[in-house]
Amino acid sequence: AVITGACDKDSQCGGGMCCAVSIWVKSIRICTPMGKLGDSCHPLTRKVPFFGRRMHHTCPCLPGLACLRTSFNRFICLAQK
């Protein structure tokens, strides 16, 4: 993820981003790019915009992509069927 600044809520981030938990410091949230094709994801990550504070360190997939299971516990952003 590209660090583009600390945040608290999605509304503080630019387009194509969400305010996700830092993978380095769990107490910090940073504006993080939404999932691109092939990126890891979680199907229950809150959609954008979310008005609370996220717990996941990944953002939802970009529009047109879906978070799909590829194996028992692995999900990646793939083109929507």
């Epitope: 769990k26 979680h42 229950l44 915009p49 979310f50 008005f51 504070r53 996220r54 717990m55 996941h56």
Partner: antibody, heavy 121, light 111 residues
Framework: EVQLQQSGPEVVKTGASVKISCKAS????????MHWVKQSQGKSLEWIGY????????TYNQKFKGKATFTVDKSSTTAYMQFNSLTSEDSAVYYC??????????????WGQGTSLTVSS | DIVLTQSPASLAVSLGQRATISCKAS??????????MNWYQQKPGQPPKLLIY???NLESGIPARFSGSGSGTDFTLNIHPVEEEDAATYYC?????????FGQGTKVEIK
């Protein structure tokens, strides 16, 4: 004070449809999702799904797809659940519950009082 | 679907003592270092009330005698010291996988 006021008890015929309402007050309606939960007599709780009160996006428990339909009316801060093709298995108390916005914990922090649905033949 | 099994089904606890309720999940409900398990209390004729979210976080306004712990597949709700008003049915709920599922409930009676 956050309040969720649900519509009154319903007694309907097998095969009919019913629409339950959940009027929200005391908070910014569009900032929170609304869940719907089923509780059959003397049984546990069953999650039906939820709707974004911001943009109307829905997520349904696969078991209730085609059975339940969620909608929201932002102007009246009311969420609705329509249940169709009713059978005796649908007789239960149905709750709306606000999502608490605790990240991906999807915790339901305020609940309506419940709407009793009885399906009779 | 993730199956949650609560035990015991019911228990009677003396006033001031500890009530311990277990919830076992059929698979892990952890992700990224967090445990996605909630606990609710329900009294007869009332809707459920949120007690604990994300395994161990006490909901605002809930007395500190309620606490939650656990990770992976094994979770516990503790009530200590138990008070008269704690007589209720308690449910665990997992929110790590769609569909979200609830345990079958544990009924707590006060002796």
């Amino acid at each position: 004070e956050v309040q969720l006021q649900q519509s009154g008890p319903e007694v309907v015929k097998t095969g009919a449809s019913v629409k339950i309402s959940c009027k929200a007050s005391g908070y910014s309606f569009t900032d929170y999702d609304m869940h719907w939960v089923k509780q059959s007599q003397g049984k546990s709780l069953e999650w039906i799904g939820y709707i974004s009160c911001y943009n109307g996006a829905t997520t349904y428990n696969q078991k209730f797809k085609g059975k339940a339909t969620f909608t929201v009316d932002k102007s009246s801060t009311t969420a609705y659940m329509q249940f169709n093709s009713l059978t005796s298995e649908d007789s239960a108390v149905y709750y709306c519950a606000r999502d608490g916005n605790y990240g991906e914990a999807y915790a339901m922090d305020y609940w309506g009082q419940g709407t009793s649905l009885t399906v009779s033949s | 679907d993730i199956v949650l099994t609560q035990s015991p089904a019911s228990l009677a606890v003396s006033l001031g003592q500890r009530a311990t309720i277990s919830c076992k999940a059929s698979q892990s409900v952890d992700y990224d270092g967090d445990s996605y398990m909630n606990w609710y209390q329900q009294k007869p004729g009332q809707p459920p009330k949120l007690l604990i979210y994300a395994a161990s976080n006490l909901e605002s306004g809930i007395p500190a005698r309620f606490s939650g712990s656990g990770s992976g597949t094994d979770f516990t709700l503790n009530i200590h010291p138990v008070e008269e008003e704690d007589a209720a049915t308690y449910y665990c709920q997992q929110i790590n996988e769609d569909p979200f599922t609830f345990g079958q409930g544990t009924k707590v009676e006060i002796k």
